[in-house]
């Protein structure tokens, strides 16, 4: 799985077990969602390409007091090579587009599933 995603590699590439755990966590979030996730908090949309893990963390780290995504935030920090703090933004953010956390998680989940499949069947 060293070249997961080819040229759009979301580097650094997490090992398949770690990626699988992140996907499982996102699945749990989407399945267990009763009330609006994180009270309907809005986050910056991101480009799901290279550097995606750091960008996702930069976006989600600005959501505070939402226990549902705390584990996801921790897992993403393990995939991002640099320290991320609130208010930090990379070029991967679509700065004019904000979406609900629930939609952000769904989009991220779909993309990670695709990356996982690509890694398995290479």
């Amino acid at each position: 799985l060293t070249c997961l995603g080819g040229f759009a590699s979301p580097g650094p590439v997490p090992p398949s077990t770690a990626l699988r755990e992140l996907i499982e966590e996102l699945v749990n979030i989407t399945q267990n969602q009763k009330a609006p996730l994180c009270n309907g908090s809005m986050v910056w949309s991101i480009n799901l390409t290279a550097g995606m893990y750091c960008a996702a963390l930069e976006s989600l780290i600005n959501v505070s007091g939402c226990s549902a995504i705390e584990k996801t935030q921790r897992m993403l920090s393990g995939f991002c090579p640099h320290k991320v703090s609130a208010g930090q933004f990379s070029s991967l953010h679509v700065r004019d587009t904000k979406i609900e956390v629930a939609q952000f998680v769904k989009d991220l989940l779909l993309h990670l599933k695709k990356l996982f499949r690509e890694g398995q069947f290479n």
Partner: antibody, heavy 120, light 107 residues
Framework: EVQLVQSGAEVKKPGATVKISCKAS????????MHWVKQAPGKGLEWIGG????????ASNQKFKGKATLTADKSTSTAYMELSSLRSEDTAVYYC?????FGGGPFAYWGQGTLVTVSS | DIQMTQSPSSLSASVGDRVTITCKAS??????LSWFQQKPGKAPKSLIY???RLVDGVPSRFSGSGSGTDFTLTISSLQPEDFATYYC?????????FGGGTKVEIK
């Protein structure tokens, strides 16, 4: 409703090649991996291999390397398995099976099976 | 390759009985295990995935448990339509491997 519809039974001579199809409907074809499973008469289930329909990337059981070739046509939502150099031990029912690895498992949905008989 | 050892290979039971089938993996499979039911001349049907999650539409008398290398399929109260052959499958890593099957027959 997810459906996997396989092509009909085949009778082939030893040494021949057969190509089985599996047409998927009820979901986005490229969202789930597609696998193929062999069941010889009176025997258990054996994984042949799988394909990611989005990329065409494959994974296969070493036992079937050189025997089974897996392909997928996104335009028709159809997966194919070609079996070459057929021998009597290739006589079996072959199933295609698909699903969401994380939501039901990769073998959640099954085709009805295609019986391939190899006989001279 | 990961070996899946299923036991027993066959069993006889009566309607209403509690039935337990086990599957042992040759290494830790991280609970990436499914159970299937197959009736003669039919395709297998998925019952359980991820070791303990019931597939939509499957009766609640079916349950899965276990972790690591040891897994169990339980039918709490056997019904006439449950007489069939059951298989486990590990999908933790390629090549995916099935157990040898357990035929549940009428006593």
């Amino acid at each position: 409703e997810v459906q996997l519809v396989q092509s009909g039974a085949e009778v082939k001579k030893p040494g021949a090649t057969v190509k089985i199809s599996c047409k998927a409907s009820g979901y986005t074809f490229t969202d789930y991996e597609m696998h193929w499973v062999k069941q010889a008469p009176g025997k258990g289930l054996e994984w042949i291999g799988g394909i990611d329909p989005e990329t065409g990337g494959t994974a296969s059981n070493q036992k079937f390397k050189g025997k089974a070739t897996l392909t997928a046509d996104k335009s028709t939502s159809t997966a194919y398995m070609e079996l070459s150099s057929l021998r009597s031990e290739d006589t079996a029912v072959y199933y295609c099976t698909s699903g969401d690895y994380f939501g039901g498992g990769p073998f959640a949905y099954w085709g009805q099976g295609t019986l391939v008989t190899v006989s001279s | 390759d990961i070996q899946m050892t299923q036991s027993p290979s066959s069993l006889s039971a009566s309607v209403g009985d509690r039935v337990t089938i086990t599957c042992k993996a040759s290494q830790d499979i991280n609970s990436y295990l499914s159970w299937f039911q197959q009736k003669p001349g039919k395709a297998p049907k998925s019952l359980i995935y991820r070791a303990n999650r019931l597939v939509d539409g499957v009766p609640s008398r079916f349950s899965g448990s276990g972790s690591g290398t040891d897994f169990t399929l339980t039918i709490s109260s056997l019904q006439p339509e449950d007489f069939a052959t059951y298989y486990c499958l590990q999908y933790d890593e390629f090549p995916y491997t099935f157990g040898g099957g357990t035929k549940v027959e009428i006593k």
